[in-house]
Interface confidence: low
């Protein structure tokens, strides 16, 4: 960081005095200060000398020394006061331009720090400041009007008390410009419009801005419409409104309507589409498949999209069976409006129970009539398995019944030892039954199949297992014969364990 000599933050001298400011840095250094007369500059490598042998009030200001080569961008500063008894102010600029809500610095620098206690800011010709003018003073920089407003665009003077009288600076003109942040704000209502031929319609295009200088127009397809304009001013904004009233719409009124507004900052445009139809309509659709399969215990949301004009007069979800006569709970039915003419209706079916499989229908009604959309919900179940020992045509037979959905596949295993479930190491024999007999297969119900395994001799130290599986899961039943002999006996002499 460069160093200034003399090494004081402020220096107070009288007019006509000689002032020498020396700045030393590691590399080359540069001075920056208020534009004022009589300074001479002498640079010698890493030092730079700013000097005058005739200081005037105009030399009052902050002088900053920087080292351009310093990557940290360090600087040092000294403030010089040239206290002229006749001139308490050094005004650096006579016009200040800011945008609304910015701070406005009026650069009147005090030439004598002793005078700070008696300073004030006034409007020219001694007029007081406007109410709510919030300002602060710095002897080094001048008066700052905080968050300047357009109405504060005035001519100001800085006042100092010298020997009991007020001494004014030359005037400073403050220009506070309104911020036109962009093109006018626009609204076009409605965002979409549908009417039956012969009905009335209204389209309203409105634009607003902080500045009155803007244009707004409404166009149909590519034709600019001649519509009387209503103008208003409220909330500090200018508003212009165009209203298109159509008593009896016809097909030629349909199409794209654009509301366009422009000012010096740019142009805004927003569009809507107007549809004219011959008669009322009601369309139901779903992005989902109308045939749904869900695992028992899981949840499902059924969604129907409705496009309708005029609006719906009624709608509901109905369970059409085949199980209980329960109806969907209203709290599980939800309706959301995407826009004026499109709605989504959702039926939530959490933790589905066996009795909730079947047909669900969504019905809706408007002046165009009734429409319905029906979903078919089938529940998936993992297989349930049971095995019994019986005689069929005199032969000992193991009979396996498996029920689930989708239809289960059946595999028989014979393994050594007594076990609840055959593992690979114990397996002696495996039989796949590719075509088990279907005992029952009704819509929305489980499918029950039966597989037979004819066993001439039941081995007493072995286990027979029936396994069934489908896409949901698997189930099994192990049959353990308990017998003294090697031959088959009637079923009541055997035990089986599930």
């Amino acid at each position: 960081i460069p160093v200034i000599e003399p090494s004081v933050p402020e220096l107070v001298v009288k007019p006509g005095a000689t002032v020498t400011l020396r700045c030393v840095g590691n590399g080359s250094v540069e001075w920056d200060g208020p534009p004022s007369p009589h300074w001479t500059l002498y640079s010698d490598g890493s030092s730079s000398i700013l000097s005058t042998n005739n200081a005037t009030f105009q030399n009052t200001g902050t002088y900053r020394c920087t080292e351009p080569g310093d990557p940290l961008g360090g600087s040092a500063a000294i403030h010089l006061y040239v206290k002229d008894p006749a001139r308490p102010w050094n005004v650096l600029a006579q016009e200040v331009v800011v945008f609304e809500d910015q701070d406005a610095l009026l650069p009147c620098l005090l030439t004598d720090p002793v005078l700070e206690a008696g300073v004030s800011l006034v409007r020219v010709r001694g007029r007081p400041l406007m109410r709510h003018t919030n300002y602060s003073f710095s002897p080094w920089h001048g008066f700052t009007i905080h968050r300047a407003k357009f109405i504060q665009s005035q001519d100001y003077q800085c006042s100092a008390l010298m020997g009991g009288r007020k001494v004014m600076s030359i005037s400073i003109r403050l220009k506070v410009q309104k911020v036109i942040p962009g093109p006018p704000a626009l609204t076009l209502v409605p965002a979409e419009l549908v009417r039956i031929r012969g009905e009335a319609a209204q389209i309203v295009c409105s634009a607003s801005s902080v500045d009155v200088n803007f244009d707004v127009f409404l166009q149909h397809n590519n034709t600019k419409l001649a519509i009387p304009q209503q103008s208003d001013f409220h909330n500090n904004r200018y508003q212009k409104v165009l209203t298109l009233n159509l008593d009896q719409v016809d097909f030629q009124h349909a199409g794209n309507y654009s509301c366009v507004a422009s000012n010096v900052q740019g142009k805004h445009s927003t569009s809507m589409f107007f549809r004219v139809v011959e008669s009322a309509y009601l369309n139901l659709s779903s992005e989902q498949n109308l045939i749904q399969e869900v695992t028992v215990g899981e949840g499902l949301n059924l969604k129907v999209m409705v496009e309708a004009y005029p609006g719906l007069q009624g709608f509901n979800w109905t369970y059409l069976g085949p199980f209980s006569d329960h109806q969907p709970e209203p709290k599980l039915a939800n309706a959301t409006t995407k826009d004026t003419y499109r709605h989504t209706f959702t039926l939530s079916l959490p933790r589905l129970k066996p009795s909730e499989a079947g047909r669900y229908s969504f019905l809706a009604r408007n002046p165009g009539g009734w429409r319905a959309l029906t979903f078919e919900l089938t529940l998936r179940y993992p297989p349930e398995v049971s095995v019994i020992w019986t005689f069929i045509n005199g032969s000992g037979t193991l009979l396996c019944a498996a029920s689930g959905y989708p239809q289960p596949n059946v595999t028989w295993l014979q393994c050594s030892g007594h076990t609840d479930r055959c593992d690979e190491a114990q397996v002696l024999q495996v039989w796949d039954d590719p075509y088990p007999e279907v005992l029952s297969q009704e819509p929305f119900h489980k499918v029950t199949v039966q597989s037979l395994l004819t066993v001439e001799t039941l081995e007493h130290n072995q286990t027979y297992e029936c396994r069934a599986h489908n896409s949901v899961g698997s189930g099994s039943w192990a049959f353990i014969p308990i017998s003294a002999g090697a031959h088959t006996h009637p079923p009541d002499e055997f035990l089986f364990t599930p």
Epitope: F99, P181, G182, H268, S269
Partner: antibody, heavy 123, light 107 residues
Amino acid sequence: QIQLVQSGAEVKKPGASVKVSCKASGYSFTGYNMNWVRQAPGKSLEWIGDINPYYGATTYNQKFKGRVTLTVDTSTSTAYMELSSLRSEDTAVYYCARRGDYGDYEGWYFDVWGQGTMVTVSS
Amino acid sequence: DIQMTQSPSSLSASVGDRVTITCHASQNINVWLSWYQQKPGNAPKLLIYKASNLHTGVPSRFSGSGSGTDFTLTISSLQPEDIATYYCQQGQSYPYTFGGGTKLEIK
């Protein structure tokens, strides 16, 4: 010099929300609309919406309406973009961009851009 | 929404070549079109605004032309540092939309 500095990369789970910040410096923050644009990996640029910092007025791309919220803090010259109900297809670099002003009466373009914030949505 | 279609989607040229990229708008956008250059891992940079105006600091080898629906970006003499993806963008109306991009490579 004029610059826009954005917050760091974010990793979010589907369904969560993300809030990206954009700090402006070197110009009058309230005098220019701030826009938000995103770019999915290997894809083109997609405009999300803009905000007028002076009034807080917003305009959103209909595609994002209901999920995106643009705000500003004029005291810190910072713009924010919050996107909710995130899904994997929201994985992208999100840019803030100042709308340019060349004294033209119409036509919009983006003359200053932030460095971008990578938002990854993954379960 | 106004659709912006750029062609070609990629292009290979030699240093010193004259390169032309076109952009077509689905409806009349007057002259409210801008062009951006984006290098990998960086934010886009404005090259041209209002169809033909060169943004501050952009080399004069870049130029833009067109109005209505058809626009062109031209690089009069391709330089190695011009390798990037170029995007057009319409500023006629909300929502602002961009072209799909043209990836420019050196032969």
